[in-house]
């Protein structure tokens, strides 16, 4: 008996070939001997089966002795043994129809779980193997689960169902809803304008939700809300904004915030959350602000940084085009009685300058 695998919703063509290369009488029946379709001369006739409106054949092939049964919009319950009667012969074809669906929405938040469920006909014992867009293979039976979805899991999942040494392939498009970056850090000199951008890692036709930026200033004992906003059809509208700092928010995606100036009291870290309509959970992006200030008070030249710096960052003070006078893995450095000239305060990571502030020291007479 020939075995054919089909996919739910697809179209399948079951073949039946006569030895004579001409149009002769044929019938297709199911295992209950109920006629599905056949011919009467050059006319297609249909029986009382459940497939009535979904069954067809190719009249153009009859003259060549081919009498296929075409079943459109396959259903799991179409799984059956189909019998083609032609020239006093019976050709049997076993059709097994499978369906593979994501048990929830195909748009999932980062960190959520994806469950793929296989619908299969009774009596079948298929195995399933799925390959994620990043090349990870998972195997299972009726259900496959992937926990803690990551951004790289966005894309087309290719799943192969194996039954009776036959294969059928499913492709499922999964969109992982996340920000492009989980965390970002902005380095600014005191007084400079600060821009925070929160690009999303996905695109959808219409995006609706609401969000908030909470800020934990290094100098503050507790965090506070800086801004709340709505997102409707991709348009951003501010609901509430703190008066200090005077934040501005863009009305278009990607989400974008502007702080008029970097000040030590704003240095710290923020957490932007975005709750999307009809989704449980929230998207998060952390943003950090490091602020540098170089000052000269009487005979003391000081350079300070505020905000979340890593312990391996180096803070230096140097006279232009000279070796560093002082270099420390600390958040403040100073030079007593500095020489006249242009001094540079540098915040660097393994030799790469992240932030630089210049201050002119005038000669003392």
């Amino acid at each position: 008996k020939k075995v054919v695998l089909g996919k739910k919703g697809d179209t399948v063509e079951l073949t039946c070939t006569a030895s004579q290369k001409k149009s002769i009488q044929f019938h297709w029946k199911n295992s209950n001997q109920i006629k599905i379709l056949g011919n009467q001369g050059s006319f297609l006739t249909k029986g009382p089966s459940k497939l009535n409106d979904r069954a067809d054949s190719r009249r153009s092939l009859w003259d060549q002795g081919n009498f296929p049964l075409i079943i459109k919009n396959l259903k799991i319950e179409d799984s059956d043994t189909y019998i083609c009667e032609v020239e006093d012969q019976k050709e049997e074809v076993q059709l097994l129809v499978f369906g593979l669906t994501a048990n929830s929405d195909t748009h999932l938040l980062q960190g959520q779980s994806l469950t793929l469920t296989l619908e299969s006909p009774p009596g079948s014992s298929p195995s399933v193997q799925c390959r994620s867009p990043r090349g990870k293979n998972i195997q299972g039976g009726k259900t496959l689960s992937v926990s803690q979805l990551e951004l790289q899991d966005s894309g087309t999942w290719t799943c192969t169902v194996l039954q009776n040494q036959k294969k059928v392939e499913f492709k499922i498009d999964i969109v992982v809803l996340a920000f492009q970056k989980a965390s970002s850090i902005v380095y600014k000199k005191e007084g400079e304008q600060v821009e925070f951008s929160f690009p999303l890692a996905f695109t959808v036709e219409k995006l609706t939700g609401s969000g908030e930026l909470w800020w934990q200033a290094e100098r503050a004992s507790s965090s506070k809300s800086w801004i709340t906003f709505d997102l409707k059809n991709k348009e951003v509208s501010v609901k509430w904004v703190t008066q200090d700092p005077k934040l501005q928010m863009g009305k278009k995606l990607p989400l974008h915030l502007t702080l008029p100036q970097a000040l030590p009291q704003y240095a710290g870290s923020g957490n932007l959350t975005l709750a999307l309509e009809a989704k449980t959970g929230k998207l998060h992006q952390e943003v950090n602000l490091v602020v540098m200030r170089a000052t000269q008070l009487q005979k003391n030249l000081t350079c300070e940084v505020w905000g979340p710096t890593s312990p391996k960052l180096m803070l230096s003070l140097k006279l232009e085009n000279k070796e560093a006078k002082v270099s420390k893995r600390e958040k403040a450095v100073w030079v007593l009685n500095p020489e006249a000239g242009m001094w540079q305060c540098l915040l660097s990571d393994s030799g790469q300058v992240l932030l630089e502030s210049n201050i002119k020291v005038l000669p003392t007479w």
């Epitope: 304008q193 821009e195 059809n233 509208s237 863009g250 009305k251 278009k252 974008h256 502007t258």
Partner: antibody, heavy 118, light 107 residues
């Protein structure tokens, strides 16, 4: 062809009211944000108000906040601007504009003139 | 509100000249900037959006550039029909604000 036709302008005394209308055609009105922009005689352009698509969020310039109300009737493909407590400085040509998908004002009507004078 | 400062307020040029108009925002507005052309007694015409994207039907002699706070509109070779007033518009957030305009006159 996308078209915007303003009407309702005219001469009004200070403190009076006027309602401007803008009839839209040639596009799916309900899916686009719409705005009013004005231009005082011999001056530059000044944004007045915007109403988002079918959500209906409204935004106003500080100079008109509390006095002007923007609204839309999607069933009639019409945008409105209700102007109350009119002042001499509201004298201008008022343009109706359509926003594109990127929220820029891409199509403008020919304008209707509002004169506030005693 | 974000202030938009346009310069120059007026300029005289000849047909064929390269003309540059600048617009400065009082704070960063990404590339959320549009340019409009207005002729006397007419409604403004939309030229450029997202700082550098030409609106369909606008001649390629017009170009825009810039990001953050500084933006430029350039007409590579001025044509007789280009004599008009040009406005920039910040579309970063509300209230939307226009520059005060630059009048391009015939020398």
């Amino acid at each position: 062809e996308v078209q915007l036709l303003e009407s309702g302008g005219g001469l009004v005394q200070p403190g009076g009211s006027l309602r401007l209308s803008c009839a839209a055609s040639g596009f799916t009105f309900s899916t686009y944000a719409m705005s009013w922009v004005r231009q005082a005689p011999g001056k530059g352009l000044e944004w007045v108000s915007t109403i988002s698509d079918n959500i209906g969020n409204t935004y106003y310039a500080d100079s008109v906040k509390g006095r002007f109300t923007i609204s839309r009737d999607n069933s009639k493909n019409t945008l409105y601007l209700q102007m109350n407590s009119l002042r001499a400085e509201d004298t201008a040509v008022y343009y109706c504009t359509k926003d594109n998908e990127d929220y820029y004002m891409d199509v403008w009507g020919k304008g209707t003139t509002v004169t506030v004078s005693s | 509100a974000i202030q938009m400062t346009q310069s120059p307020s007026s300029l005289s040029a000849s047909v064929g000249d390269r003309v540059t108009i600048t617009c400065r925002a009082s704070q960063g507005i990404r590339n959320d900037l549009g340019w409009y052309q207005q002729k006397p007694g007419k409604a403004p015409k939309f030229l450029i959006y997202a700082a550098s994207t030409l609106q369909s039907g606008v001649p390629s002699r017009f170009s825009g550039s810039g990001y953050g706070t500084d933006f430029t509109l350039t007409i590579s070779s001025l044509q007789p029909e280009d004599f008009a007033t040009y406005y920039c518009l910040q579309d970063y957030n509300y209230p939307r604000t226009f520059g005060q305009g630059t009048k391009v006159e015939i020398k």
